[in-house]
Interface confidence: low
């Protein structure tokens, strides 16, 4: 047992930088997926920076599966947004496929193979849960 | 930065129960996977349990590539072995696929899709590094 | 590009066992969403049984329940689809069909939304006595 | 009997147009789930003609469409032609069925 000291991420979590991440084992929904990572005291991922990016495309190189992450729009006529509602900055990363498509439920936002895809979020992927590292001696 | 406390696990390694585990982001042949895990001071997976198999198996479900693993032999008349020298617990998994061929360079086994099969160790693939976890304060 | 190819046809007694196999090819199985759907002669589409993205994982409809068994072999990525206890009103052809996106990227559980686009070419089972 | 209908046979002219109906409830087609049609030519499997209630897989001219709305889906066909004589079936997911359904089919007759 770790005395007198807290983990950076707790098990099962990769730490990196100044964040957790963990890669869910069960596929779901994208809001299910929200709920998922708030029940951990996550977020959803956010990528703020093509460094984020760059590690999280090494991390999910042996995966063909898409993964949820917290980018999502109403419809086509609203702007990309995280769930802290900050917009997506325009040179991160283009985002392919489904972009002008309205859907019910939202448009949400998945990385596959190092690229970020746009499509119905009702649909069900592996999502990426984000947090900040514990990084002070407790 | 952690204060008067050593992390359990190294960036970007997955810290679980006693041990720390590294999925590689590149694909080599058995020995230079070895080599690899070896340089970050660190052996080819052990699983020692089923719990230990539960996990990897969990932590590679998004995944449909094969991860070597740190268990060979020289050929079908040897037994299969450990990094360490220890024998397999024919308990905890089957291994399935070329088990009864002989290849020059030995005969691997890797974990795909849940399941071990035994490969000539000059195939490349994926591999999965482990090391102890550094349980205590410092 | 995803291809499904089916074992042959078979020629049963009733109160015997089939087992259909389909071979996926150009994607492994665990990437797809594999389903089972018959058609007796002169009749429409009948689906047995499949992947269920509710709960990810296979569903047998209740007609089928006790009767149909769906494996998969991951290391040969074929599925199997066996039924027992035949009867005649079992003649069919039997489909392996399954989904690959609108990226063509087989994902598990997308069928949902995108459909079937990819049928095996059938096998007929014929139950006689 | 299906959990969806659809009628038994529509005909048509070449040139005119043509709909087929697939009726299903609150548990399939009503719940949000999306409606599939299917092309069967004799002799052949069948063909994904309409995904998602009204997209088309690249291949398939724009003659067909699909629409939804509310336990209802329907197809249309538009500028019949002889090559379009098929059955045509439709395809939901049912919740309380725990899976796929599909309706009994159309048998379209070019005139």
């Known amino acids: 047992r770790v005395a007198n000291c807290s983990a950076p991420c707790p098990q099962d979590w990769i730490w990196h930088e100044e964040n957790c991440y963990l890669f869910s084992t069960g596929s779901f929904n994208w809001e299910k997926s929200q709920e998922k990572c708030l029940s951990l005291d996550a977020k959803l991922l956010k990528i703020n920076s093509t460094a984020d990016l760059d590690f999280i495309q090494q991390a999910i190189s042996y995966s063909s599966f898409p993964f949820w992450m917290g980018l999502s729009r109403r419809n086509p006529s609203y702007p990309w947004l995280w769930e802290d509602g900050s917009p997506l900055m325009p040179h991160l990363f283009r985002i392919r496929g489904a972009v002008s498509q309205t859907y019910p439920s939202g448009t949400c936002a998945y990385i596959q193979r190092g690229a970020v895809y746009a499509e119905n979020c009702i649909l069900a992927a592996f999502s990426i849960c984000q947090k900040k590292a514990n990084l002070r001696a407790q | 930065r952690v204060a008067n406390c050593s992390a359990p696990c190294p960036q970007d390694w997955i810290w679980h129960e006693e041990n720390c585990y590294l999925f590689s982001t590149g694909s080599f042949n058995w020995e230079k996977s070895q080599e690899k895990c070896l340089s970050l001071d660190a052996k080819l997976l052990k699983i020692n349990s089923t719990a230990d198999l539960d996990f990897i198996q969990q932590a590679i479900s998004y995944s449909s590539f094969p991860f070597w693993m740190g268990l060979s032999r020289r050929n079908p008349s040897y037994p299969w072995l450990w990094e360490d020298g220890s024998p397999l617990m024919p308990h905890l998994f089957r291994i399935r696929g070329a088990v009864s061929q002989t290849y020059p360079s030995g005969t691997c086994a890797y974990i795909q899709r849940g399941a071990v099969y035994a490969e000539n160790c000059i195939l490349a693939a994926f591999s999965i590094c482990q090391k102890k976890a550094n349980l205590r304060a410092q | 590009q995803v291809q499904l190819v089916q074992s042959g046809a078979e020629v049963k007694k009733p109160g015997a066992s089939v087992k259909v196999s389909c071979k996926v090819s150009g994607y492994t199985l665990t990437e797809l969403s594999m389903h089972w759907v018959r058609q007796a002669p002169g009749k429409g589409l009948e689906w047995m049984g499949g992947f269920d993205p509710e709960d990810w994982s296979n569903h047998v409809s209740q007609k089928f329940q006790g009767r149909v068994t769906m494996t998969e072999d991951t290391s040969t990525d074929t599925a199997y689809m066996e039924l027992s206890s035949l009867r005649s009103e079992d003649t069919a052809v039997y489909y392996c069909?399954?989904?690959?996106?609108?990226?063509?990227?087989?994902?598990?559980?997308?069928?949902?939304?995108?459909?079937?686009?990819?049928w095996g070419q059938g096998t007929t089972v014929t139950v006689s006595s | 009997q299906s959990v969806v209908t659809q009628p038994p046979s529509v005909s048509g002219a070449p040139g005119q147009r043509v709909t087929i109906s697939c009726t299903g409830s609150?548990?399939?087609?009503?719940?949000?789930?999306?409606v599939h049609w299917y092309q069967q030519l004799p002799g052949t499997a069948p063909k994904l003609l309409i995904y998602?209630?009204?997209n088309r897989p690249s291949g398939v001219p724009d003659r067909f469409s699909g629409s939804k709305s509310g336990t209802s889906a329907s197809l249309a066909i538009t500028g019949l032609q002889a090559e379009d004589e098929a059955d045509y079936y439709c395809?939901?997911?049912?919740?309380?069925?725990?899976?796929?359904?599909f309706g009994g089919g159309t048998k379209l007759t070019v005139l």
């Open positions: 069909l399954t989904s690959t996106g609108r990226q063509g990227k087989g994902v598990r559980g997308w069928d949902y939304y995108y459909g079937m686009d990819v």
């Open positions: 998602g209630n009204s």
């Open positions: 609150s548990s399939n087609i009503g719940a949000g789930y999306d």
């Open positions: 395809q939901s997911y049912d919740s309380s069925l725990s899976g796929w359904v």
